[in-house]
């Protein structure tokens, strides 16, 4: 009879066991386990009539289709085999162990005692079939096994062939190089990858395989297994396979689509193909005169560009349009997008006047291209270039003409200062005890006329101030200060103000520059009780042409002491000009009494001491300050008047060859101006240079080397 | 012909304010000075400051610093004279009058309580 | 401040004849620059705004008639009526301008 066994072990023991088992006997144990396991069976105990291979009573081991053992006897011979210590082990998970005893025992024989038991099955060890073996990675567990995949690859449902995800490759660029997964390592199993190259309509692609050509092939079938296959819109080329590469393949198409098929066995190579977009040849391109194409190349294709240049110091002119450089293209039907263009020479085309300057050419004609070469220079004896520059500009590559110092900026022409165009002379007769000066004497002396509207009538003075650039008059704060109200100190409106330069006769205004004020600055600590800070500045509305009657006086060096005791100096002035003339005198005859004709007068400086004590010594309350010098004659005869107010006391600069304005004429004693004792003050310009040049905006560094040759 | 006409009559309590009003036409308002001056009942005339309508600038009599305030509209030509702080001696005529030369008819404050 | 002083305070003189005011500044009232006296004189009527005579001391304002002038310089001023009409009667000031403008305390004048 037969016993089904399940369990996952268990005994066996011979019928009647452990006593004699019966003749004629015949009983069959089915042993079944879970998959993924095998029986293990061995024997504790076994004792069998002996035969001659087992034909009498035997115990028999077997699965669906094999013998795994036949067992008889009480020990081992060589014709019968007993189990011993052996262990059967079963292939799979059943097992069938059939006992047979015969129709005769001659002695008693106590049978067999027989234990089984399920063992797992290592299947990563054991699985030599590459139908049923993981492709990469195998994992055991007791009862079974499970495949996984290396990274980038994906276990394909048959839970065994690691494929790859590649049906998603585009190729847009005009060349390009695609391999099957893994090139030159064994393709993936089980995989269907898809290559597309999509160009750009015009180009056509080329194919050609490279290298390693090894796809899985059979020697009857063609490519049945694994192959490649490209698409080129209906057409199908392929099947390709096997170790013969393919010819080179002209699509005559802009799209293409590679199938790449592979089952889920076999070790190949694979294989690797290089593509090239091609398209309609351009007509040979020449450069154009003085100037070259990049990249060059004996043939130009569709979507080929080409940049066009010229040499340093030429323009690409396309359609009367210059530019650095253009671009053409090589389109699909196999001509150019634009004819070539030239090559002109860079014109820098007329310089920039020069404010005060004049402009030559070095080249001849008068040429403005490339290379060309012009000077600027400044109007002289009036002007000079600031900082020596040459002057020499060079027409660039870039069409902008060029100095080595100033880059493309402009020189500037500045003011000559402190050099009249006929020189003072040296005797100077002993404006009150004056003399008429010469045009062009005094060419920075200017008249300032206030007319101030605002009061009901209006008031009308003048005074004089000093030309320090173009734009700039220097003066005392007093002149342009409101008359009326003392006790504040309010600037006169700029419109209430005239500036009259290159003046000689007042009566004749007409060879002279009358300019209107753009701003009035008084000194912010201009103090009216004492005339200190007595300064002030008047920009221009417009600045004025320089020439032999309007130039500037140069600025002193920042010098506290200001000038030296007994020095000469010069101040000019359209003042009362008439000592004996006096106040009364003045009020009733109006302005008669101004001088018609410019007047000056030379005047040394006087030792401080003296001049505070002079004052001092007065009835009054005077104050000569650190801000002022007094200048004049202890006997008296020449002084600075009323209507000289604001002008300049200028000393000869020896170092510099100019005249310098250290003074502006301020204010003066009690008496008549000239008399004995009575000692002019004047504004000590040198304590404000700093002032000056701030409020003219500009640093002292850039006029100072004027004054400090 | 140059005008000045100035507002009417005012009547305050001590510690008010007052706010008198001139109206200039004939010239141009911007570019003279506006002065204002006082005159009690049976008094001579007392000069309190003025303002240049153009640019806002301002000269006050030391005795009215801190109490005047004056102010100018060009768009209307109308100058302003406001004193705070009023006491019964601060009743009389206030006059404005362009620079030297032309008044307005005058406005009488009456300072009391 | 500068300090103004008229006299007399009032003064009575006939149809016809002469007035003469004085008035005197405690300051120089000559600005230098200008060349001016900063004085002006004012006539004032009962019950209307001062009326200007005189500016910078001697000049007449356009429609004051040639009997009025003024004269001086520096701190004495004086204002004369040559021959007083009826409608001369009134009050008369003098205002410097020189500084913060400051007015003299007025002379009255009368028929006699």
């Known amino acids: 009879h037969t016993v089904e066994l399940n369990n996952m072990f268990g005994q066996i023991q011979s019928p009647g066991y452990p006593d004699s088992y019966p003749s004629d006997s015949e009983v069959t144990w089915n042993i079944t386990v879970p998959d993924g396991f095998r029986i293990k069976l061995y024997f504790m105990h076994f004792n069998l009539e002996s035969s001659y291979l087992c034909e009498y009573d035997y115990v028999k081991v077997e699965t669906e289709d094999q013998v795994l053992a036949t067992f008889c006897g009480r020990e081992t011979t060589d014709t019968e085999q007993t189990p011993g210590q052996e262990v059967v082990l079963s292939p799979g998970s059943f097992m069938s162990i059939t006992f047979r005893s015969d129709f005769s025992n001659e002695e008693r024989f106590t049978g067999f005692d027989a234990h089984y038991m399920a063992v797992d099955v290592d299947e990563c060890k054991e699985r030599e079939d590459e139908e049923l073996s993981c492709d990469h990675y195998c994992h055991n567990y007791i009862g079974g096994y499970y495949c996984s995949c290396r990274f980038g690859y994906i276990l394909h449902t048959d839970n065994r062939t690691c494929r790859v995800e590649c049906s998603d490759n585009l190729f847009t660029q005009r060349t390009g190089v695609i391999t099957s997964p893994d090139f030159p390592n064994p393709y993936p199993k089980s995989s269907e990858c898809l290559y597309t190259i999509e160009l750009e309509e015009g180009f056509m692609v080329n194919l050609q395989f490279e290298d390693i050509f090894d796809i899985e092939d059979h020697p009857e079938v063609p490519c049945p297994y694994d192959y490649i296959k490209i698409k080129v819109g209906p057409k199908v080329l392929g099947p390709f396979c096997g170790e013969k590469a393919p010819e080179p393949i002209s699509t005559q198409s802009h799209s293409v689509l590679i199938l790449f098929h592979s089952d889920n066995s076999g070790e190949n190579r694979g294989w690797r193909l290089s593509y090239r977009a091609a398209g309609n040849e351009c007509p040979e391109l020449q450069p154009p005169v003085h100037g070259k194409i990049e990249p060059s190349q004996a043939k130009y294709f569709f979507k080929d560009q080409v940049l066009v240049s010229c040499d340093t110091g030429y323009k690409v002119l396309k359609d009367n349009v210059e530019m650095d450089t253009f671009q053409i293209e090589c389109l699909k039907d196999g001509t150019w997008s634009n004819k070539i263009p030239t090559c002109k020479i860079v014109d820098c085309r007329a310089p920039g006047e020069l404010e005060h300057g004049l402009i030559t050419f070095s080249t001849r004609n008068n040429l403005t291209t490339y290379k060309s070469e012009i000077k600027y220079s400044c109007q002289e004896p009036y002007y000079k270039m600031l900082n020596n520059n040459t002057g020499i500009y060079t027409c660039s590559a870039q069409g902008v003409w060029m100095n080595k110092v100033l880059g493309r900026s402009l020189p500037t022409c500045l003011p000559e200062c402190g050099q009249p165009s006929r020189s003072l002379p040296s005797l100077v007769k002993r404006i009150i005890g004056g003399r008429n000066a010469e045009p062009g004497l005094f060419p920075w002396q200017a008249l300032i006329v206030v007319e101030d509207t605002s009061r009901v009538p209006n008031d009308k003075w003048f005074g004089s101030g000093a030309l320090l650039s173009a734009s700039w008059i220097l003066t005392a704060a007093h002149v342009l200060r409101s008359q009326r109200r003392d006790t504040t100190v309010i600037p006169v409106s700029k419109e209430h103000v005239t500036v009259y330069l290159g003046l000689h006769d007042v009566r004749d205004k007409s060879g002279a520059v009358n300019s209107s004020a753009a701003r009035v600055v008084l000194h912010p600590d201009f103090n009216i009780q004492n005339y200190n800070h007595d300064i002030a500045l008047v920009q221009l509305q417009e600045p004025v042409p320089l020439g032999p009657h309007v130039m500037p006086v140069c600025l002193p060096r920042l010098e506290p002491e200001g000038p030296a005791p007994h020095m000469l100096g010069l101040v000019a002035g359209w003042g009362i000009s008439n000592p004996n003339v006096t106040v009364d005198e003045i009020i009733s005859s109006g302005t008669r009494t101004l001088s018609d004709v410019l007047q000056y007068v030379k005047l040394p400086v006087v030792p401080h001491a003296e001049c505070k004590t002079s004052y001092e010594s007065r009835s009054g309350n005077y104050s000569v300050t650190e801000n002022m010098f007094c200048a004049g004659y202890y006997e008296g005869g020449k002084d600075t008047c009323l209507g000289d107010s604001g002008g300049a006391f200028v000393i000869f600069d020896d170092l510099s060859q100019r005249w310098v304005v250290q003074g502006l004429v301020s204010w003066g004693g009690p008496e008549e101006c000239g008399s004995k004792q009575v000692y002019g003050v004047y504004t000590k310009v040198s304590n404000y240079v700093d002032w000056v040049w701030e409020q003219m905006g500009l640093p002292q560094s850039v006029v100072e080397p004027q004054v400090e040759r | 012909q140059v005008q000045l006409v100035q507002s009417g009559a005012e009547v305050k309590k001590p510690g008010a304010s007052v706010k008198v009003s001139c109206k200039a036409s004939?010239?141009?308002?911007?570019?003279?000075?506006i002065e204002w001056v006082r005159q009690a009942p049976g008094q001579g005339l007392e000069w309190i400051g003025e303002?240049?309508?153009?640019?806002?600038?301002?000269n006050y009599n030391e005795k009215f610093k801190g109490r005047a305030t004056f102010t100018a509209d060009s768009s209307t030509s109308t100058a302003y004279m406001e004193l705070s702080s009023l006491r019964s001696e601060d009743t009389a005529v206030y006059y404005c009058?362009?620079?030297?030369?032309?008044w307005g008819q005058g406005t009488l404050v009456t300072v009391s309580s | 401040d500068i300090v103004m002083t008229q006299s007399p305070d009032s003064l009575a003189v006939s149809l016809g004849e002469r007035a003469t005011i004085n008035c005197k500044s405690s300051?120089?009232?000559?600005?230098?620059?200008?060349?001016?006296?900063?004085l002006a004189w004012y006539q004032q009527k009962p019950g209307q705004p001062p009326k200007l005579l005189i500016y910078?001391?001697?000049t007449r304002e356009s429609g004051v008639p040639d009997r009025f002038s003024g004269s001086g310089s520096g701190t004495d001023f004086t204002l004369t009526i040559s021959s007083l009409q009826a409608e001369d009667v009134a009050v008369y000031y003098c205002?410097?301008?020189?500084?913060?403008?400051?007015f003299g305390q007025g002379t009255k004048v009368e028929i006699k």
């Open positions: 009058l362009r620079s030297e030369d032309v």
């Open positions: 004939g010239y141009t308002f911007t570019g003279k000075w």
């Open positions: 303002i240049l309508p153009g640019t806002g600038s301002t």
């Open positions: 300051q120089s009232l000559l600005a230098s620059r200008t060349r001016k006296n900063y």
């Open positions: 910078w001391a001697s």
């Open positions: 205002k410097q301008s020189y500084n913060i403008p400051t």
